[in-house]
């Protein structure tokens, strides 16, 4: 019949698809690190560039005081690469840096801090041995995985030794997250 509408017997309601461009996301890049205090049982957190060069924060994802702030609950892909560099002559110094029983290694941890929970949560960890490599060594550690995060969660990247982080190029050391 002309002008008559036929509705399906089983109506399905579809939520409108959200444009990727509206989703919270950030890519932070390395900058020179300043000496910093850190908790006794926790590796120091890296400080990041949030705005210059390749770095950005978008759609309410904010960076402040070494933390990425999660603006809304959901599943996020979180990633970081930290490139370390040094010389084998530093291996004895690494050994003396309060970790005498551990191998000469470098470690990166992506940590979540939730205000309602007293202890930071380690989300991802990567460790490499460095002292068997050549006299001038470079070692990147990449971490990335999906996590369910809550609004207000804070993310940071901790490293075993800030002085070994290569901060010379923004494509060598970076940190980011985006809502899936």
């Amino acid at each position: 019949l002309k002008g008559q509408e036929f509705a399906p017997s089983h109506q399905q309601v579809y939520a409108p698809l959200r444009a990727d461009g509206d989703k919270p996301r950030a890519h932070l890049t390395v900058v020179r690190q300043t000496p910093t205090q850190h908790f006794k049982n926790q590796f120091p957190a890296l400080h990041w560039e949030h705005e210059l060069g390749l770095a950005f924060t978008k759609n309410r994802m904010n960076y402040t005081n070494k933390f990425l702030l999660i603006p809304e609950s959901g599943d996020y892909f979180i990633y970081s690469q930290v490139t370390f560099r040094g010389m084998t002559s530093e291996c004895s110094e690494i050994r003396q840096a309060g970790r005498p029983n551990k191998p000469d290694s470098i470690t990166v941890v992506i940590t979540k801090v939730t205000d309602s929970y007293p202890e930071p949560t380690q989300l991802l960890m990567g460790t490499k041995s460095v002292c068997e490599v050549g006299s001038n060594w470079f070692q990147p550690i990449y971490l990335g995985a999906m996590f369910s995060l809550q609004e207000g969660d804070k993310l940071m990247v901790n490293v075993s030794d800030i002085s070994l982080v290569d901060y010379t190029k923004e494509d060598k050391t970076f940190f980011g997250a985006f809502l899936l």
């Epitope: 560039e49 705005e51 060069g53 005081n65 901060y167 010379t168």
Partner: antibody, heavy 118, light 107 residues
Framework: QVQLQESGPGLVKPSETLSLTCTVS????????WSWIRQPPGKCLEWIGY???????KYNPSLKSRVTISIDTSKNQFSLKLSSVTAADTAVYYC????????????WGQGTLVTVSS | DIQMTQSPSSLSASVGDRVTITCRAS??????LNWYQQRPGKAPKLLIY???SLQSGVPSRFSGSGSGTDFTLTISSLQPEDFATYYC?????????FGCGTKLEIK
Amino acid sequence: QVQLQESGPGLVKPSETLSLTCTVSGGSISSYFWSWIRQPPGKCLEWIGYIYYSGQTKYNPSLKSRVTISIDTSKNQFSLKLSSVTAADTAVYYCARETGSYYGFDYWGQGTLVTVSS
Amino acid sequence: DIQMTQSPSSLSASVGDRVTITCRASQSINNYLNWYQQRPGKAPKLLIYAASSLQSGVPSRFSGSGSGTDFTLTISSLQPEDFATYYCQQSYSTPRTFGCGTKLEIK
């Protein structure tokens, strides 16, 4: 010790293009953000824009249509071109280095006065 | 653009005085606030970065504080060489913006 030195003509005619070069000595031009900043006589400082060693630029929207900043890493230099100048562009022009947003402009050139006049 | 407002625009003080200059941002800039000193005919010189961190080589009589939108530069005991113009600048976002300065003069 890092040093920055501006060079270029001190007098430019209205409607012409202002061209300045900043030479960086005592350090590499890589891994830093290099800005141009200007200060009209007796007035406030105004950021013009920056260039990264990779060639990436960002400009002040108020000047964007007239500004080009370029870099020559082999010569440790970066340059400013400002087209269609008027008397309002008369200022001391500074080049400056920024390590990252957290650190401010830690090194500056001594500045060069550019007068726009016929 | 983020507007930066400094007060006072000028200030008279004597050697040995404690002086405070304030800077207000039009929106929150966390602690991305820098202070510069400029003497006549010279380029600005970075004194304080990240609101409260003293730049290398700057005397400890200079200090900075604040976060969010309100910031303060304090000179604990003025020295003859401190009479100059002081600028605040935000580095939270581009375009970078400066306050219009506080001229510190000898009383």
